[in-house]
Interface confidence: low
């Protein structure tokens, strides 16, 4: 675990650098996703460990404001508060070493346990790929920032210019829960394993070679599409929400977040000095600035708030976690002092619950959410926010419960919707999914424009057999979520050819092709050999792809990489498949044997990425019963021939055959992608 | 299926090294993160270490720390536990366990403790 | 973290409902699990997270609790349900195992 060495990465990663900041992090990471607006940056901070504790100052009535406060009494809300603070998280205990006597913080640290660690990506990625990335999948304008909601100079101003101080929501088009994708980007997927399909496996980058420095022109662009099967999220501020609504954006304009209470009005001078420095970008001046406003003004919100967004700033300048564990602690601070606006208060603990999730505290990020709503608990959009919230840690049914309780309140609540679809459809209720997926979109609530959803309502729609399925992907590709009706891929690089099906001088692999029809009777009997000696090194199809059926895999070589254990059981065919670097270097595929047995149907679903060609050299093929089709082309294998498609292209197989059905999978490279994109582009 | 197999365990002399080892089978070994428990005769379980899926970092037990030695082969699909000086207070019953994981869509690490575990090996310590 | 569990034997007839406790020595929120150890066997996990059932685990087992105490329950004991019960926390390293609870038959 030990932590991302900033100063190792710093200045590797340019070339990612999606948002301008100068360097690789995570916002970048949003943006090649799709996820996140090309814009503001904030710190690239994997997780470390938990907050330190600060206990509350005594807690004393709030004075009420008389705009945009939640309907509750605010003395409800600093009582709640009290509660809830001292109720903290063991993430905010001030813990010791492990061998003291209360050992070191686990849960925001253990991430480390699975594949999916944010510390593993940040220390080894490849600064190849391009900020160029851009993705048909999301056009985002532009992020807020964590202080575009609150200019000072003008939101202090709570009067000189009446537009000035709006928060800036109405242009906004950041998807709901899609703000930072911490853990997403590179990973190698705990969840799936993908079989002919087939899912995403994600893994980190591995480290180029030190001598090969990348210029501005080796640029790579990846687009890469929203969908990612599984994926970790943030949930934006509520003022990044767009609305196209006319009245609502006039409802907007006219609410000016109050974050002065009495005492800051008299102190404005001071606070507008002070915030000048943090907008000029003299952050460590600012932060100066504001930790003396504290020490003369300990009750003052706004100082306080201040000095947060100082601290948050710092911690994205010098990318350090513990710079910005501070900031997120210093954001709590706000939400204990007494008489804090409830604007205020809803703005600091928004940040705290979005900078949690930055530095992957999932289940601490829930709980300052949880505090959220208890403390607007008719702000509808916190009740969405808390619903991702618990999606992010994995606790399906609690989001399904929110979601539900939203929807009995505000039933055309487009977001809601869609995120109920999405679970119901987790939850294999597929037919029960639909129309809460379709109404979602349709609604065209912020948020629900969003790449997966269309994937889901699709998938949904091909699997109940309504043919509107395809409505709903041309929908999506017109809105920017696909390549095209048919190529739903996600993982894309621009440009490359794009057409379902290929012939071998096509590819310009004709060797490779050559080799594996000659020797298909090798490959053939080594993998028979391994379903009669060690069929347990078969693994079964485990992504929901199959109708019905028994459908399992053999693989030897994944992300790029070889597999001892499985070579053993072939290892002619594994030493023959060496000579070809197309396919062993392939970090975006597999080498597999494939057994389909009969009565198997797997639904037409789509590949991960464009930049793989999938080969499948027939090897035990019944005479009839089974055959593929990618996009609107149906084939059938041959023993001792190699069929050739790209798999970004939606495809379906039938198995009816009275005998088993074994084929050899083998990817490669798209022809395309040069050899210094093939070295730089993130394994799958 | 899923399956854990500890090695042979075995009678050592205290201050001697001994290696455990844990067969995995069934599902994607390097995809998952992976732990040692023990259990001395009669008493409760201790947890003892834990391993990243990529082997690059671990965590141990106050009791064993500076003496145990966590690594996997995912090449083989291999746990390993290599222990060193032992004590009589480390004879038990070992047991290697997976870090089972959530396929939940949202969630990529969020993950169910310890959901499958080996059949346990016996170790002890004395001269 | 120091985990207690409380009492260490229960005796209780077949189709009893059977409410364990567990004690943490420091808040874990909901960052614990619940292990079942039969003689001679290997542990099996039952819930994760205070209350989200494992594979395989019967319905008849819950979990409930939060921060520093928790109560799992059987609502009747069936004959197989006669173990060592272990409570677990991974809110801090390093993890830890409570002392155990074996319900045994009355």
């Known amino acids: 675990f030990d932590l991302v060495d900033y100063e190792e990465v710093l200045g590797k990663l340019g070339i990612y650098d999606a948002d301008g900041d100068g360097d690789f992090d995570v916002d970048d990471a949003k943006v090649l996703l799709g996820l996140k607006e090309r814009s503001t940056s904030e710190p690239a901070v994997p997780p470390e460990e938990a907050e330190p504790h600060t206990e509350p100052e005594e807690q004393v009535p709030v004075e009420a404001e008389p705009q945009n406060i939640e309907d509750e009494a605010k003395e409800q809300i600093q009582s709640l508060l009290h509660e809830m603070v001292h109720a903290e998280h063991v993430e905010g205990e001030d813990l010791q070493q492990e061998d003291g006597p209360t050992g070191e913080p686990q849960q925001e640290d253990d991430e480390f346990l699975m594949a999916t660690d944010v510390d593993d990506r940040f220390e080894t990625l490849e600064p190849e790929v391009s900020h160029e990335e851009t993705e048909h999948s999301y056009h985002v304008e532009e992020t807020v920032s964590q202080d575009c909601n609150q200019d000072m100079e003008e939101m202090m101003s709570e009067q000189e210019n009446p537009d000035s101080s709006e928060p800036v929501v109405e242009d906004e088009r950041l998807h709901h829960d899609t703000d930072d994708v911490t853990y997403q980007v590179y990973e190698e997927q705990a969840v799936y394993e993908p079989l002919e399909n087939e899912g995403i496996e994600i893994t980190e980058v591995t480290a180029p070679p030190e001598d090969n420095p990348v210029e501005d022109s080796q640029v790579i662009v990846e687009e890469v599409s929203i969908f990612p099967v599984e994926e970790q999220q943030e949930v934006p501020p509520e003022t990044n929400r767009k609305t196209d609504d006319p009245e609502q954006k006039a409802k907007v304009k006219k609410k000016k977040p109050k974050l002065l209470n009495k005492f800051d009005k008299t102190i404005k001078a001071e606070l507008d000095a002070a915030e000048k420095l943090r907008k000029r970008g003299k952050i460590e001046e600012a932060v100066n600035a504001f930790k003396e406003l504290v020490r003369k003004y300990p009750q003052s919100p706004r100082a306080r708030y201040g000095k947060a967004q100082c601290e948050d700033d710092l911690a994205e300048k010098r990318r350090s976690n513990e710079v910005l564990r501070g900031a997120i602690e210093t954001y709590q601070e706000v939400a204990s002092l007494p008489d804090v606006p409830a604007d205020l208060l809803k703005l600091s603990l928004k940040r705290r619950s979005d900078r949690q999730q930055f530095l992957g505290h999932m289940r601490g990020s829930l709980l300052t959410l949880q505090r959220l709503v208890q403390l607007f608990p008719n702000d509808t959009s916190l009740k969405n926010d808390l619903g991702v919230g618990y999606l992010l840690i994995g606790d399906n049914d609690n989001a399904k419960k929110v979601y539900e309780e939203v929807l009995s309140v505000t039933p055309n609540d487009g977001f809601a919707k869609v995120h109920y679809g999405f679970i119901l459809k987790a939850q294999n209720k597929i037919a029960e999914s639909i129309p809460y997926l379709k109404e979602g979109i349709e609604s065209g609530d912020p948020g629900t424009d969003d790449g997966r959803f269309y994937f889901h309502l699709g998938d949904a729609m091909q699997r109940v057999g309504n043919k509107e399925a395809y409505k709903w992907y041309e929908l999506g590709h017109k809105r920017g979520h696909f390549a095209s009706v048919w190529q739903r891929s996600l993982y894309n690089v621009n440009g490359l050819k794009a057409q379902p099906w290929w012939t071998p001088k096509e590819t310009g692999y004709t060797e490779l092709v050559k080799s594996l029809e000659r020797n298909w009777k090798l490959i053939r009997d080594e993998g028979l050999a391994v379903m009669d000696k060690a069929k347990g090194l078969f693994l079964p199809e485990d992504e929901n792809l199959r109708e019905k059926g028994d459908w399992s895999q053999f693989t030897l070589w994944q992300q790029g990489r070889r597999n001892e254990n499985a070579c053993k059981g072939a290892p002619k065919t594994c030493t023959l498949l060496e000579k070809f670097p197309e396919t062993t270097g392939c970090r975006r595929g597999q080498i597999k044997y494939s057994i389909m047995h009969p009565g198997t149907h797997v639904w037409p679903h789509t590949g991960p990425t464009n930049c793989r060609l999938r080969m499948h050299l027939g090897l035990v093929i019944p005479k009839e019963g089974c055959k593929i089709r990618c996009a609107n082309e149906t084939k059938t294998w041959e023993e001792g021939k190699v069929l050739i498609f790209d798999d970004s292209f939606e495809h379906e197989v039938w198995q009816d055959a009275s005998s088993f059905r074994l084929i050899f999978i083998v990817d490669v490279w798209h022809p395309e992608l040069t050899p210094q994109q093939r070295r730089s582009l993130p394994a799958i | 299926q899923v399956q854990l197999v500890e090695s042979e365990g075995g009678v050592v002399q205290p201050g001697r090294p001994l290696r455990l080892s844990c067969a995995a089978s069934g599902f994607a070994f390097s995809s998952h993160a992976m732990h040692w428990v023990r259990q001395a005769p009669g008493k409760g379980l201790e947890w003892v270490a834990v391993?990243?899926?990529?082997?690059?970092?671990?965590r141990y037990a106050g009791s064993v720390k500076g003496r145990f030695t966590i690594s996997r082969d995912n090449s083989k699909n291999t746990l390993y536990l290599q222990m060193n000086s032992l004590r009589p207070e480390d004879t038990g019953v070992y047991y290697c366990?997976?870090?089972?994981?959530?396929?939940?869509?949202?969630?990529?690490?969020?993950?169910?403790?310890?959901?499958?575990w080996g059949q346990g090996t016996t170790v002890t310590v004395s001269s | 973290i120091v985990l207690t569990q409380s009492p260490a034997t229960l005796s209780l007839p077949p189709r009893e409902r059977v409410t364990l406790s567990c004690g943490t020595s420091?808040?874990?929120?909901?960052?614990l699990a619940w292990y079942q150890q039969k003689p001679g066997r290997a542990p099996r996990v039952l819930t994760y997270d205070v209350a989200n059932k494992a594979a395989g685990t019967p319905a008849r087992f819950s979990g409930s609790g939060s921060e520093t105490d928790f109560t799992p329950a059987i609502s009747s004991l069936e004959p197989e349900d006669f173990a060592v019960y272990y409570c677990q926390q991974r809110s801090n390293w390093p993890q830890a195992f409570s002392p155990g609870t074996k319900v045994d038959i009355k």
């Open positions: 366990a997976r870090v089972g994981r959530s396929s939940n869509w949202f969630s990529r690490y969020y993950y169910y403790d310890m959901d499958v």
């Open positions: 391993i990243s899926h990529d082997g690059s970092r671990d």
């Open positions: 420091q808040n874990v929120s909901h960052h």
